[in-house]
């Protein structure tokens, strides 16, 4: 008898090379094989559970950056007046949540912020829990 | 044939709003659906393997905090003279281990330390390994 | 019917007690039960996917340390002029990758660097993905 295989784990790596002041970051998924989807610059959460979250990037100017998952809830990450980020966190997310950026700068210019090595990774830690697609 | 489902992953999120000087923190699990249990202010480890551990909190006074898992072993985390913690770690834990806090303050008062946003998350990383219940 | 078990997750914990200047660190796996293997002071990657990586250690002198996974690619970790490390990261690794250290010191002596509590942990986060053995 063939041993059971794991169904694919919900995970995604998105990249971002620019962020818009007082808006968010333009995220793209470089792989077509991702088990999670991007929609309207947000990562869609289909499965309840803990997620491992990794966020990296170098910015072209000083900015304040927050990563949100639900309206009216506090941010997953919040960094104030930084030119880079390299953070890891764990958070409980649920079906219908959407993970998205908010970015503000102190410059009078409203030009886009350029990002080098911008990467956001989400990995579901509770396969077997509730999912809805 | 129905594809095999994942059995639930061993994981837990506990909250704590107060810690007792020269003792530990009073932990409660907000969800009844957790796959790990709390007993005597300790999280009980049933399954051998690596665990992802996230610890967060803001304290009402400066304290030294350690997170232990086994008598006679070094701590999983150890923070000296802090008013907040936001740490992530990986550790190998085994059946019969118990994860618990030890807290000391430098104040003459022996009152409880109040904690804002106190949260400890453990997530098993090696399903399929040895477990005993 | 017996519920399906998880096949073992690819993971490994290696220890290192010394590093050689302008070379790497001598890594050993304390357990025979590891699901990943060490070869030529490198950890062999058989399975594609995200990996949780934990790196710890205290060094006998100031050094610069990098953790690589593929020739011609940037490091997984890069620390400059440190005497200790306690870092966690997430990276996408693939079959044929090899995880290894590179270390340089600024001392004129070419003696080995002694390491206390040197530990590197890798844990695969995408079981069910492609593996080759």
């Amino acid at each position: 008898q063939v041993p059971p295989q794991y169904p694919p784990i919900q995970s995604i790596r998105v990249q971002f090379t620019r962020c818009e002041n007082e808006k968010g970051c333009i995220i793209t998924s470089p792989s077509k094989d991702e088990t999670m989807k991007v929609q309207d610059n947000s990562i869609i959460i289909n499965c309840d559970g803990f997620y491992l979250i990794s966020l990296k990037g170098y910015f072209s100017e000083e900015l304040s950056l927050s990563l949100y998952y639900r309206k009216g809830r506090g941010p997953l990450f919040s960094l104030s007046k930084v030119t880079s980020v390299d953070s890891i966190g764990v958070a409980y997310l649920a079906f219908k949540d959407k993970v998205y950026f908010n970015v503000t700068t102190h410059s009078t210019s409203y030009k886009d912020i350029q990002v080098n090595g911008g990467e956001l990774i989400l990995i579901h830690q509770n396969p077997g829990g509730f999912c809805a697609y | 044939q129905v594809p095999p489902q994942y059995p639930p992953i061993q994981s837990i999120r506990v909250q704590f709003t107060r810690c007792e000087n020269e003792k530990g923190c009073i932990i409660t699990s907000p969800s009844k659906d957790e796959t790990m249990k709390v007993q005597d202010n300790s999280i009980i480890i049933n399954c051998d393997g690596f665990y992802l551990i996230s610890l967060k909190g803001y304290f009402s006074e400066e304290l030294s905090l350690s997170l232990y898992y086994r008598k006679g072993r070094g701590p999983l985390f150890s923070l000296s003279k802090v008013t907040s913690v936001d740490s992530i770690g990986v550790a190998y834990l085994a059946f019969k281990d118990k994860v618990y806090f030890n807290v000391t303050t430098h104040s003459t008062s022996y009152k409880d330390i109040q904690v804002n946003g106190g949260e400890l998350i453990l997530i098993h990383q090696n399903p399929g390994g040895f477990c005993a219940y | 019917q017996v519920p399906p078990q998880y096949p073992p997750i690819q993971s490994i914990r290696v220890q290192f007690t010394r590093c050689e200047n302008e070379k790497g660190c001598i890594i050993t796996s304390p357990s025979k039960d590891e699901t990943m293997k060490v070869q030529d002071n490198s950890i062999i990657i058989n399975c594609d996917g995200f990996y949780l990586i934990s790196l710890k250690g205290y060094f006998s002198e100031e050094l610069s340390l990098s953790l690589y996974y593929r020739k011609g690619r940037g490091p997984l970790f890069s620390l400059s002029k440190v005497t200790s490390v306690d870092s966690i990261g997430v990276a996408y690794l693939a079959f044929k990758d090899k995880v290894y250290f590179n270390v340089t010191t600024h001392s004129t002596s070419y003696k080995d660097i002694q390491v206390n509590g040197g530990e590197l942990i890798l844990i695969h986060q995408n079981p069910g993905g492609f593996c080759a053995y």
Epitope: S66, S80 | R18, F59, S60, D86 | -
Partner: antibody
Framework: EVQLVESGGDLVRPGGSLRLSCVAS????????MSWVRQAPGKGLQWVAF????????TYTDVVRGRFTISRDYAKNTLYLQMNSLTAEDTAVYYC???????????WGQGTLVTVSS | SFVLTQLPSVSVTLRQTARITCGGD??????VYWYQQKLGQAPVLIIY???NRPTGIPERFSGASSGNTATLTISGALAEDEADYYC??????????FGGGTHLTVL
């Protein structure tokens, strides 16, 4: 020197909305926990809402929960209080207060007056 | 919910000792904070965690707490100490509770 400057107080009709702001200077805003405390004319202090330094945790006094929202903008070094469904009982001077330790109100602004009346 | 009770007013003769009390069920088991508010001004933290003085607060201010009562003591009250004084604790739900305030008159 630490400074907290509130603004946004006004006369508003019952059922109306108002957003208060508190601009912080002289300290690292990201490291400080923030609260709103109010004082009705001739009355004592009443704590209204709290947000921790990372913005991840908020708490409210029971009488405002569901109507008021506390938030912070790190780029602008500003604390906000969005007040909806206002009633005459919300009439007060609103102070913002900051603390390096979450339980302390170390520094206070001079307050902004909110009057709810028809 | 937790309630802190203060006397509305206390009088003290200049340079005498004033004691302002704050009553609450087992308040001595909680950390108590005291704030001073002079007329037309914002409050100022004068005692934290029962008995600790922030930098810049004169030594004549001291605090203590046990049982059902917390006490703010002003040893050798000055005219400039005339103000409203508020005790405050955090309840078990991390909500701040203020006492009703005591007005200190220096005679």
């Amino acid at each position: 020197e630490v400074q907290l400057v509130e603004s946004g107080g006004d006369l508003v009709r019952p059922g109306g909305s108002l957003r208060l702001s508190c601009v912080a200077s002289g300290f690292t805003f990201t490291n400080y926990h923030m609260s709103w405390v109010r004082q009705a004319p001739g009355k004592g202090l009443q704590w209204v809402a709290f947000i921790n330094s990372g913005g991840s945790s908020t708490t409210y006094t029971d009488v405002v929960r569901g109507r008021f929202t506390i938030s912070r903008d790190y780029a602008k070094n500003t604390l906000y209080l969005q007040m909806n469904s206002l009633t005459a009982e919300d009439t007060a001077v609103y102070y913002c207060a900051s603390g390096a330790i979450w339980t302390h109100f170390d520094h206070w602004g001079q307050g902004t007056l909110v009057t709810v009346s028809s | 919910s937790f309630v802190l009770t203060q006397l509305p007013s206390v009088s003290v003769t200049l340079r005498q000792t004033a004691r302002i009390t704050c009553g609450g069920d087992s308040v001595g088991s909680k950390s108590v904070y005291w704030y001073q508010q002079k007329l037309g001004q914002a409050p100022v933290l004068i005692i934290y965690r029962d008995s600790n003085r922030p930098t810049g607060i004169p030594e004549r201010f001291s605090g203590a707490s046990s049982g059902n009562t917390a006490t703010l003591t002003i040893s050798g009250a000055l005219a400039e100490d005339e103000a409203d004084y508020y005790c405050q604790v955090w309840d078990n739900s991390n909500k701040a509770i203020f006492g009703g305030g005591t007005h200190l008159t220096v005679l």
